[in-house]
Interface confidence: medium
């Protein structure tokens, strides 16, 4: 009796009801190997989840995160909201990179600036909250009164930047 | 390989009680800041509580404050959320979590591993 089981292809079950024929899953189920005695039920992409493929007799639903989120977790699991360029997800919520850090996408954490002066270089274009600085020639290469770098911004302290 | 392994969650009913528990294997739990993180249905992820490696400082969301409390047994290697007075809202999808970070209530999202959760659903 197993061998029957065994020769029912994917999206199929092994009916024990039935003197082990193959029946196809029913609506809304899937099994993706053969020789299985039940079908899963497929995954349901609501509310934050969109669905990426529809569910098929041989294989689940997949799902993203709506816009405004992000997947996390093994096959998209979980959604996490974005943030703006310039923030960081943080517990309770979205804040801004303290000065000094930088994030130029919607998820992740904020970074310190570049220290252009640890290479030697000079800072070309200060960083913001969005950007990093960038980094110009060493000060030694510019030769007097022909440096086109913007002079460093007035120093702040250290701490958050206004939301 | 890291795991974590959450079990606990079920049907309660308003005003009930429930015990959600975290088993956690692959790594020295004990160095580690935990979180419980949770996803209600059609929302995104709402962080619940923190509780830093020795189980001394310990952090909640607003909305689980006072009802909610998180605890840790590293002899046993497992995270802990005893969870009181619940409430419809509380319905979700519990997720414990491995921090790389300190745990404070206001770092970032500092999280390496996930576990599969586990489903809580408070209804009468």
């Known amino acids: 009796l197993q061998d029957l089981c065994s020769n029912c292809p994917a999206g199929t079950f092994c009916d024990n009801n039935r003197s082990q024929i193959c029946s196809p899953c029913p609506p809304n189920s899937f099994s993706s190997a053969g020789g299985q005695r039940t079908c899963d039920i497929c995954r349901q992409c609501k509310g934050v989840f969109k669905t990426r493929k529809e569910c098929s007799s041989t294989s689940n639903a997949e799902c993203d995160c709506i816009s405004g989120y992000h997947c996390l977790g093994a096959e998209c699991s979980m959604c996490e909201q974005d943030c703006k360029q310039g923030q960081e997800l943080t517990k309770k919520g979205c804040k801004d990179c303290c000065f000094g850090t930088f994030n130029d996408q919607k998820r992740g954490i904020c970074r310190p600036w570049t220290n252009c002066s640890l290479d030697g270089k000079s800072v070309l274009v200060n960083g913001t909250k969005e950007r990093d600085v960038v980094c110009g020639p060493s000060p030694a290469d510019l030769s007097p009164g022909a440096s086109s770098a913007t002079p460093p911004a007035p120093a702040r302290e250290p701490g958050h930047s206004p939301q | 390989e890291v795991q974590l392994l959450e079990s606990g969650g079920g049907l309660v009913q308003p005003g009930g009680s429930l015990r959600l528990s975290c088993a956690a294997s692959g790594f020295t739990f004990s160095n580690y800041a935990m979180s419980w993180v949770r996803q209600a249905p059609g929302k995104g992820l709402e962080w619940v509580s923190s509780i830093d490696a020795s189980g001394g400082d310990t952090y909640y969301a607003d909305s689980v404050k006072g009802r909610f409390t998180i605890s840790r047994d590293n002899s046993k290697n497992t995270l802990y959320l005893q969870m009181n007075s619940l409430r419809a809202e509380d319905t979700a999808v519990y997720y414990c979590?491995?921090?790389?970070?300190?745990?404070?209530?206001?770092?970032?999202?500092?999280?390496?591993?996930w576990g599969q959760g586990t489903t809580v659903t408070v209804s009468s």
């Open positions: 979590a491995k921090e790389g970070s300190h745990g404070t209530d206001d770092s970032h999202y500092d999280v390496d591993v």
